[in-house]
């Protein structure tokens, strides 16, 4: 009796089970009662990453430098090329099809997590006792200067954007 279902890594065609092509190879011709499935290796810059019956291999992804992309991992006959972004940029999506400049944290905000090739900068507001007076993709919130340790007194209170201003203590006459 002709089969109605096939084993793993096989497919049903013309009432018979044929072997799928292994990753890195494409289908040239289906099996017959006399011959096995005929498969051919994918060409240069092509890949197939699963057991398959595809007649064409997929093209490796192109990491377009005009979109800020560069190759993170070169593709093989069994894997696609993995793109990442140039320094200072990050991917706009998981597929990393384009890049955008890392966001900077405005004054009053510090960097909680520095951006990577795949994630943007994460900013946090500077809490009481800390400040950031620059727009930066790297700078964390800095603690206010401790006037006391310098034998000075606070002349001007700090904010989330400015440090305290220290001054000499009033001399007793």
């Amino acid at each position: 009796e002709p089969p109605t279902a096939c084993r793993e890594k096989q497919y049903l065609i013309n009432s018979q089970c044929c072997s799928l092509c292994q990753p890195g190879q494409k289908l040239v011709s289906d099996c017959t009662e006399f011959t096995e499935t005929e498969c051919l290796p994918c060409g240069e810059s092509e890949f197939l990453d699963t057991w398959n019956r595809e007649t064409h291999c997929h093209q490796h992804k192109y990491c377009d430098p005009n979109l800020g992309l560069r190759v993170q991992q070169k593709g093989t006959s069994e894997t696609d090329t993995i793109c990442t972004c140039e320094e200072g940029w990050h991917c706009t999506s998981e597929a990393c099809e384009s890049c955008v400049l890392h966001r900077s944290c405005s004054p009053g905000f510090g960097v909680k997590q520095i951006a990577t090739g795949v994630s943007d900068t994460i900013c946090e507001p500077c809490p009481v006792g800390f400040f950031s007076n620059v727009s930066s993709a790297f700078e964390k919130c800095h603690p206010w200067t401790s006037c006391e340790t310098k034998d000075l007194v606070v002349q001007q209170a700090g904010t989330n954007k400015t440090d305290v201003v220290c001054g000499p203590q009033d001399r007793l006459r």
Partner: antibody, heavy 117, light 107 residues
Framework: EVQLVESGGGLVKPGGSLRLSCAAS????????ISWVRQAPGKGLEWVSS????????YYPDNVKGRFTISRDNAKNSLYLQMNSLRAEDTAVYYC??????????WGQGTLVTVSS | EIVLTQSPATLSLSPGERATLSCRAS??????LHWYQQKPGQAPRLLIK???QSISGIPARFSGSGSGTDFTLTISSLEPEDFAVYFC?????????FGGGTKVEIK
Amino acid sequence: EVQLVESGGGLVKPGGSLRLSCAASGFTFSNYGISWVRQAPGKGLEWVSSISSGGDNTYYPDNVKGRFTISRDNAKNSLYLQMNSLRAEDTAVYYCARAGEKAMDYWGQGTLVTVSS
Amino acid sequence: EIVLTQSPATLSLSPGERATLSCRASQTINNNLHWYQQKPGQAPRLLIKYASQSISGIPARFSGSGSGTDFTLTISSLEPEDFAVYFCQQFSSWPLTFGGGTKVEIK
């Protein structure tokens, strides 16, 4: 017991025709593809033709394509090879062989075809 | 067309000796190769399928190995009835092709 019995061989002149038969028994003939394989005197094996179990697909090497025709009659458990425009190089023992798991798992005893003037 | 080259053409050995027969394909054929034995005046007989799979009724002294382009048929200890011609056959693509054969003869 699986049995394949070839017949129809003989002496034929170049350019002539011959029809070989293969009678099958001991298995469900309609479930198996069958091939013809030949062997010239003192030489190796050469595939000649194959036909699928249903008879809808036939296969030939280039050197016999257009001259040889394989066919089958599943109701009669029989396989045929019509050979036309025969040449001296077609002289050989012709075997029919059953295809089981893509291997020629059972063979007939062969029938001799001699092409000579 | 896939060409199968068998070597040696003739192997002269004594009963009890080990026989190693080679079959090389002109391009990769995975494990899509069978081995046959033929004795004088007889039809070929299937010995090994899919390069290494044994066949019911064939003595265990016959074994096959290899994948890709290089294949080996081994007879671990020759019996008198093993002196014959051995053929490999590929079924990776059309046309089906056989090797030229290796004759195992008594030394």
